[in-house]
């Protein structure tokens, strides 16, 4: 006989990422004896909640909680039974609920209460359902990316922890209702609301972060539609041959399109609108989303928001990734430079509906949105955030790192479960050959 070492016990954590268009559940795991190590927490499994985001259940809060049941039942299977009681469960809602909270705080509260009621019925250690601020969403996305890529600290072969010389990565997240940019900066922010000080593994990080509400993909598309209805009898970003009927109430119900709402509009009126495949007019329409007219600081990104110059490498995830991946994979277009990204956007915007459908078989209606989406991503990065060709070369578009989805959820859990200590880790026991 010989001694067989038992695998280390695993701990688990669950985060429900309640986005504006849908909810995703992430289950994370880590060895119980290495809780304070870096790069140790990874994704165990995930589950996409069917239906829309929880904010879409404003008129039916119980529907929001009911929608989560399938994934929660999966969690019961995915997490070993003996670990259920010790597994923290969090729900974080983002910009969809921030918007609902602005327009209908009572409905927002009701949805969170209904969801809380359901989550407490499960044997996990439920630790709350809340709406994240834009700043939290940005910072936790940055923490996730850098944690997964082991940019905070590494364990050296001589048995010592050290800070990698490569520095941290900036993070850019494009959600359904908001977009976030977060990166480490050396100088203090001129706008204190955009600065976060972090202490991780004994290191100090000064981080710039800003979240632009109403600049998520879905809300941008809705704002462009409102603009097209206002200024054209057609939609320049939609493909020629794409024909819709629009209920005005559906366009103007969002607080993001409130400014474009006609004074006396009939919410039940229907308008027919077709696409025109016009890249130049589409570019003009997208440009109208950004204002560069005033800046109360030494420099701004857009809409008078302070932003230091982008520095270092960046990871762009969520809808940034999906948009660029569509251009690269479905359309077969190069997007390695800003110039190529712009050319790819123009290429998609030139396609007719029949051409697009032939290129990407199946009647996927969201195909009609890729022109506007690509044009927006290109303009947001170049004109909005100020990436030039050199800086753009340092942007990677990624969905996962170390088999774990890049997003705010992991960073949120790491923070709330104290899996990233503020103090430096002690030396490991072992042989030092020096």
């Amino acid at each position: 006989t010989r001694d067989v070492r038992e695998p280390p016990a695993l701990k688990y954590g669950i985060v429900l990422d309640a986005g504006s268009s849908h909810t995703s559940m992430f289950i994370y795991k880590w060895p119980a004896d290495k809780e304070n190590d870096t790069g140790i927490v990874g994704q165990h499994s995930s589950c996409d909640v069917p239906g829309g985001g929880i904010s879409s259940y404003a008129d039916n809060p119980s529907g929001a909680s009911q929608s989560l049941v399938g994934c929660l039942e999966q969690a019961l299977q995915d997490v070993p039974k003996e670990r259920h009681a010790g597994t923290p469960l969090y729900l974080g809602a983002t910009a969809g609920m921030r918007l609902l909270n602005l327009t209908n705080p009572e409905a927002s509260t009701s949805v969170l209460m209904a969801v809380t009621h359901t989550l407490t019925q499960y044997p996990f250690d439920f630790r709350g359902a809340r709406i994240l601020s834009g700043q939290e969403e940005g910072v936790f996305g940055w923490v996730t990316a850098n944690y997964l890529l082991e940019n905070f600290i590494k364990y050296g072969w001589v048995g010592r922890w050290f800070r990698p010389r490569k520095g941290t990565l900036g993070a850019m997240d494009l959600g359904g209702a908001s977009t976030q940019i977060t990166f480490e900066t050396t100088s203090p922010a001129e706008d204190r609301a955009s600065e976060v000080q972090l202490h991780l593994y004994g290191q100090h990080y000064r981080v710039y972060t800003h979240s632009f509400l109403c600049y998520g993909r879905d809300q941008v598309l809705q704002r462009l539609l409102a603009s097209a209805l206002q200024t054209h009898g057609f939609h320049p970003c939609w493909p020629r041959g794409f024909s819709t009927q629009v209920l005005l109430g559906d366009v103007y119900q969002s607080p993001c399109t409130m400014a474009q709402r006609p004074q006396n509009f009939n919410s039940s009126a229907r308008v027919s609108l077709s696409g025109s495949s016009d890249p130049h007019l589409c570019r003009d329409l997208v440009s109208g989303l950004f204002s560069f007219s005033s800046c109360p600081f030494s420099r701004c990104s857009f809409n008078g928001v302070f932003q230091p110059p982008v520095a270092g490498n960046f990871v762009a995830f969520s809808a940034f990734f999906y948009t660029v991946d569509f251009l690269r994979t479905s359309m077969g277009l190069p997007v390695a430079t800003l110039q190529q990204l712009e050319a790819a956007a123009v290429n998609v915007c030139n396609q007719t509906w029949a051409q697009l459908q032939a290129r990407v078989p199946g009647q996927r209606a969201r195909l009609a949105d890729y022109c506007a989406g690509a044009m927006f991503v290109q303009q947001l990065l170049s004109r909005g955030y100020g990436f030039d060709e050199r800086a753009f070369g340092g942007v990677i578009f990624q969905k996962k790192a170390a088999d774990t989805a890049v997003g705010w959820a992991l960073g949120y859990m790491l923070n709330l479960t104290n899996l990233i200590p503020a103090d430096p880790p002690g030396l490991r026991k072992g042989t030092d050959f020096s």
Epitope: T244, Q245, S272, W353, G362, Q363, R364
Partner: antibody, heavy 124, light 111 residues
Framework: DIQLQESGPGLVKPSQSLSLTCSVT?????????WNWIRQFPGNKLEWMGY???????NYNPSLKNRISITRDTSKNQFFLKLSSVTTEDTATYYC?????????????????WGQGTSVTVSS | DTVLTQSPASLAVSLGQRATISCKAS??????????MNWYQQKPGQPPKLLIY???NLESGIPARFSGSGSGTDFTLNIHPVEEEDAATYYC?????????FGGGTKLEIK
């Protein structure tokens, strides 16, 4: 109000071609929408056959691709179905319908305007 | 092609009661958090008429006693309270991918 009306022979011989016309009133077929043909078999099963879009592009059901042709005459505001090499299996009620993408944060293809249908029997 | 299977093939419901019709898809008809499922009503001698789009959105002019729910592969049409004029055949239809396909229909009879 948009109205559609099918017309054509009620009886077609096997191996021949079936030709039907859909006349549209109340809306120009070049202004927007997709102009579909759908058929309903004797057992009530519905099958989408294809469409011609407002700008003249076609989209056909792959199961009929080699036999179907949908064309239009914009001056008469009509669109047509031609189905070749028919068999008794093509006996059905044929409907023309106007469709479009209904917006609601995404786009949902619906067929909202229908003709009354015309019955076609394939028999020798 | 996406095959849609409706059940039951027919049902008889008393006036004022609830009618529930199920539609099961051979593959998910969801994309990007949206469900591409429509419901149509067809009365004898008439063409189909759109009732519900996007799984749960009521077409304008359709009474609120009609409601749709579901996502992924499982969808339901509910009618409550059932009225005399609701006697018809009901079809589900997916538009997530080409070609659009219809379910086999459910015939509703009022007792």
């Amino acid at each position: 109000d948009i109205q559609l009306q099918e017309s054509g022979p009620g009886l077609v011989k096997p191996s021949q071609s079936l030709s039907l016309t859909c006349s549209v009133t109340g809306y120009s077929i070049t202004s927007g929408y997709y102009w579909n043909w759908i058929r309903q078999f004797p057992g009530n099963k519905l099958e989408w056959m294809g469409y011609i879009s407002y700008d003249g592009d076609n989209n056909y059901n792959p199961s009929l691709k080699n036999r179907i042709s949908i064309t239009r005459d914009t001056s008469k505001n009509q669109f047509f179905l031609k189905l070749s090499s028919v068999t008794t299996e093509d006996t059905a009620t044929y409907y023309c319908a106007g469709g479009y993408y209904r917006y609601g944060l995404s786009y949902y293809y619906v067929m909202d305007y229908w003709g009354q249908g015309t019955s076609v029997t394939v028999s020798s | 092609d996406t095959v849609l299977t409706q059940s039951p093939a027919s049902l008889a419901v008393s006036l004022g009661q609830r009618a529930t019709i199920s539609c099961k898809a051979s593959q998910s008809v969801d994309y990007d958090g949206n469900s591409y499922m429509n419901w149509y009503q067809q009365k004898p001698g008439q063409p189909p008429k759109l009732l519900i789009y996007a799984a749960s959105n009521l077409e304008s002019g359709i009474p609120a006693r009609f409601s749709g729910s579901g996502s992924g592969t499982d969808f339901t049409l509910n009618i409550h309270p059932v009225e005399e004029e609701d006697a018809a055949t009901y079809y589900c239809q997916q538009s997530n991918e080409d070609p659009p396909t219809f379910g086999g229909g459910t015939k509703l009879e009022i007792k």
